[in-house]
């Protein structure tokens, strides 16, 4: 902390300019007027400050504003929002989408610190649920933001957020993530017709149950395997052979390469060996003809 | 980066000196570049400096209107004219360079520094 000292003789700052950085740290402190500082903070950004004499104008700051800074100085920050700890960062009260996108950009670039990631708490928690405009915001900084979330954060996300999540957003999503986002995007999406539904749902099939697969298979949607692989493996197994030959399309073929790995190994030994053969991949593992299968889950569920 | 001063001596009191401030193997762009000096005993204090955005020049009061500061950005140099030189102007004077490095602050670099003795 810098030493209280009186302000020499001509010093004394009438505004906040570029002169200030030629100040020593005890000048700055005894010079510069903390709410002549708050009124100028926008001024701060142009100015190239040393990590030390920036020290001193938070210093200032705080003491002006002990039970926190109101947003109006919030949103000038610039450079010094990089100073704050996420325990400043708890005080405040931001409610501007712009204040937010004015401090996401000072840290363009970089992982998301301890002190965005406190900032974007306390602005959701104050928004009360992620609203597109937010997450639209928040994905064009962090693309990996959503996935990032808990499901029961996840969960406050309201299907008309989902217009905003590009394909590369979900990237890191787990399963469980999905199993969350995927009914709020079929949500979302159910008023777009079939292709450009496939399109859009894509990226969030990871979450879809047996059904919604079954549906897509009668609807000629050409499913890459990329996207197959990271389907739920609970989900593709009930899928029969004619079934996933519909939901692929031209893309069958790729299931040879991936016969080794869930789902499709898990999936092809389910599967009548007679009925893989149809699709005349090679594909080995299946049921041999002439066995029984029992389905013991339909079994435990009518006992 | 490396500043190099030059152009101190000893000098008679009302007497001028020009000192000269070269600086080398620049990273980032420089914001401002000035003179502060030293005296036995005494803190360091800034003496005048130049930014070279709007060519604007600072000095300490104890200075103003005897020294003189300019300099040329895209030489990377920086001179201080000082003319009626007082016994009180004796110290060594250091060069600084303030380079712009936002979004995350500012560096401060500074010479070797050249002894001005006026008698």
């Known amino acids: 902390e810098v030493e209280k000292t009186a302000c020499p003789s001509g010093k004394k700052a009438r505004e906040i300019d570029e002169s200030l950085i030629f100040y020593k740290k005890w000048e700055l402190e005894a010079c510069v007027d903390a709410a002549l500082l708050a009124t100028q903070m926008d001024r701060v950004n142009a100015i190239p400050f040393t990590y030390e004499q920036l020290d001193v104008l938070k210093h200032k700051l705080d003491e002006l504003y002990p039970q926190g800074y109101p947003e109006s100085v919030i949103q000038h920050l610039g450079y010094l929002f990089l100073k704050m700890s996420p325990e400043d960062i708890r005080k405040w009260n931001v409610t501007s989408l712009e204040t937010l996108k004015a401090l996401l950009e000072v840290n363009k670039g970089h992982e998301m610190s301890p002190q965005v990631a406190t900032l974007i708490d306390r602005f959701v928690k104050g928004r009360g649920q992620l609203d597109k405009d937010t997450l639209d915001t928040l994905t064009a900084f962090y693309p990996g933001y959503l996935c990032s979330l808990s499901p029961e954060e996840l969960s406050s996300v309201p299907p008309s957020s989902i217009w905003a999540v590009r394909p590369q957003d979900l990237d890191t999503c787990d399963p469980r993530q999905l199993d969350v986002l995927y009914p709020k995007a079929r949500l979302a999406f159910q008023n777009m017709n079939g292709s450009e539904y496939f399109v859009k749902i894509q990226s969030f099939l990871g979450g879809a149950p047996t059904e919604d697969l079954k549906a897509l298979s009668q609807q000629n949607v050409s499913m890459d395997l990329a996207t197959f692989m990271k389907l739920r493996t609970d989900a593709v197994l009930p899928l029969t052979v004619a079934e996933v030959q519909k939901l692929l399309g031209p893309h069958v073929e790729g299931l040879k390469a991936e016969e080794r790995h869930r789902p499709v190994r898990d999936w092809i030994l389910r599967q009548r060996q007679d009925d893989l053969d149809t699709l005349g991949l090679g594909l080995q593992g299946g049921i041999p003809n002439g066995y029984l299968v029992l389905d013991l889950s339909m079994q435990e569920a009518l006992s | 980066v490396q500043l190099v001063e030059s152009g101190g001596g000893l000098v008679q009191a009302g007497g001028s000196l020009r000192l000269s401030c070269a600086a080398s193997g620049r990273t980032f762009s420089s914001y401002a570049m000035g003179w502060f000096r030293q005296s036995p005993g005494k803190e360091r204090e800034f003496v005048a400096a130049i930014s070279w955005s709007g060519g604007n020049t600072y000095y300490a009061d104890s200075v103003k209107g005897r020294f003189t500061i300019s300099g040329d950005n895209a030489k990377n140099t920086v001179y201080l004219q000082m003319n009626s030189l007082k016994p009180e102007d004796t110290a060594v004077y250091i060069c600084?360079?303030?380079?712009?490095?936002?979004?995350?602050?500012?560096?401060?670099?500074w010479g070797q520094g050249t002894s001005v003795t006026v008698s």
């Open positions: 600084n360079e303030r380079t712009t490095v936002l979004p995350t602050g500012a560096m401060d670099y």
